[in-house]
Interface confidence: medium
């Protein structure tokens, strides 16, 4: 199948595609944490990995992280400085209530991460997203079958009776 044909198939169901995109962006908005370390809380982050998402590279990638060099002491105002090895850049892991490149901004209202409300909202949005995907797939398949049935010919015309084996030559 050509790329054009795939695109034609994907772009055909406009309403399902719109719902699909809406669901995806809602999910993305909730799960937009930039750095999610895979180190155990309280464990040394000298050498572990993290899931990173940057503005330059919107894809989530798994990278190695270590502590920043000593000359970066004090760089992060309210947080821990970590060095993203694969991306060759420093990053501040802010303390609760702080944000910004160097953890310089303070939140007046602080919610504990992964509160019950947050988990519930995430679960609801994931369910909505899955319903959207299933619904979109169903309506797309129905549309595609209807379009195919209206076509005057199959992709390959049957022109003779089937002869899988030939008679004596």
């Amino acid at each position: 199948m050509t790329a054009g044909r795939r695109m034609e198939m994907l772009c055909a169901g406009r309403v399902p595609a719109l719902l699909l995109c809406l669901g995806f962006h809602l999910l993305q908005a909730v799960l937009s944490t930039t750095v999610i370390p895979s180190c155990i809380p309280g464990e040394s982050s000298d050498n572990c990995t993290a899931l990173v998402q940057t503005e330059d590279n919107p894809r989530v990638a798994q990278v190695s992280i270590t502590k920043c060099s000593s000359d970066m002491n004090g760089y992060c105002l309210h947080g821990q400085c970590i060095y993203l090895v694969d991306m060759s850049q420093n990053y501040c892991r802010c303390e609760v209530g702080y944000t910004g490149v160097r953890c310089e901004h303070f939140f007046l209202t602080v919610h504990q991460p992964l509160s019950k409300e947050y988990v519930a909202l995430t679960v609801i949005l994931i369910i909505l997203f899955l319903i959207t995907v299933v619904g979109s797939t169903y309506y797309f398949c129905r549309w595609y079958r209807n379009r195919k049935s209206k076509e005057p010919k199959k992709e390959y015309e049957r022109v003779t009776s089937g002869d899988p084996e030939l008679p004596q030559v």
Epitope: Y156, E157, R158, V159, T160, S161, G162, V169
Partner: antibody
Framework: VEESGGRLVTPGTPLTLTCTVS????????MAWVRQAPGKGLEYIGF??????TYYATWAKGRFTISKSSSTTVDLKIITPTAEDTATYFC????????????????WGPGTLVTVSS | QVLTQTPSPVSAAVGGTVTINCQAS????????LAWYQQKPGQPPKLLIY???KLPSGVPSRFKGSGSGTQFTLTISDLECDDAATYYC????????????FGGGTEVVVK
């Protein structure tokens, strides 16, 4: 499978060749026409399917017409013969796979010679 | 769609082996809708191989077809005097309709 109707014709005079089959019903088989100029290779002209749909080689469109005149005969009409149409014309059954998609010609008739000359 | 046969002519001694190549300018339908025919002077073509490698009943196993897509080969082993003939490959294509193309033919001379 046997062809007939080949003869000497003058340029521009339409000529119809007939392919007669025995032992098979043309409502279940496709039949093709292939020609061979003296000392040259085989050249596919076109074929007629079991549903009477006709398919022609690009070069043959508008120059030939294939039709079923009965349940046992297939005709090839050379609309406006020229000297280049001088050849032996073969009729062959189109053999399909289990899906009915065509892939082979078998069996072939002995051929009929058409000479176009003034 | 063009089928190019090489070499032509080809000669070999009795008992020998000849190989004929057939190259398609674009992929054959289903990658294997290719047939080989043998034609002797004054006779219609005779089917030797269909679906690239299948042998119809009645054709000696000395004839072997191989290949897929755009490159195909007919190999005749244990050559006999009766094998002297012209060999043609024929491909099937689909492009909004069915099309057939024959190769230019390869003459086999048996010494």
């Amino acid at each position: 499978v046997e062809e007939s109707g080949g003869r000497l014709v003058t340029p521009g005079t339409p000529l119809t060749l007939t392919c007669t089959v025995s032992g098979i019903d043309l409502s279940t088989f496709a039949m093709a026409w292939v020609r061979q100029a003296p000392g040259k290779g085989l050249e596919y002209i076109g074929f007629i399917s079991l549903s009477d749909a006709t398919y022609y080689a690009t070069w043959a469109k508008g120059r030939f017409t294939i039709s079923k005149s009965s349940s046992t005969t297939v005709d090839l009409k050379i609309i406006t013969p020229t000297a280049e149409d001088t050849a032996t014309y073969f009729c062959a059954r189109v053999v399909g796979d289990s899906s009915g998609y065509p892939n082979t010609f078998h069996p072939w008739g002995p051929g009929t010679l058409v000479t176009v000359s003034s | 769609q063009v089928l190019t046969q090489t070499p032509s002519p080809v000669s070999a001694a009795v008992g020998g082996t000849v190989t004929i190549n057939c190259q398609a300018s674009q992929s054959i339908h289903n990658s294997d809708f290719l047939a080989w025919y043998q034609q002797k002077p004054g006779q219609p073509p005779k089917l030797l191989i269909y679906r690239a490698s299948k042998l119809p009943s009645g054709v000696p196993s000395r004839f072997k077809g191989s290949g897929s897509g755009t490159q195909f080969t007919l190999t005749i082993s244990d050559l006999e005097c009766d094998d002297a003939a012209t060999y043609y490959c024929q491909g099937t294509y689909y492009s909004g309709g069915w099309y057939f193309t024959f190769g230019g033919g390869t003459e086999v001379v048996v010494k």
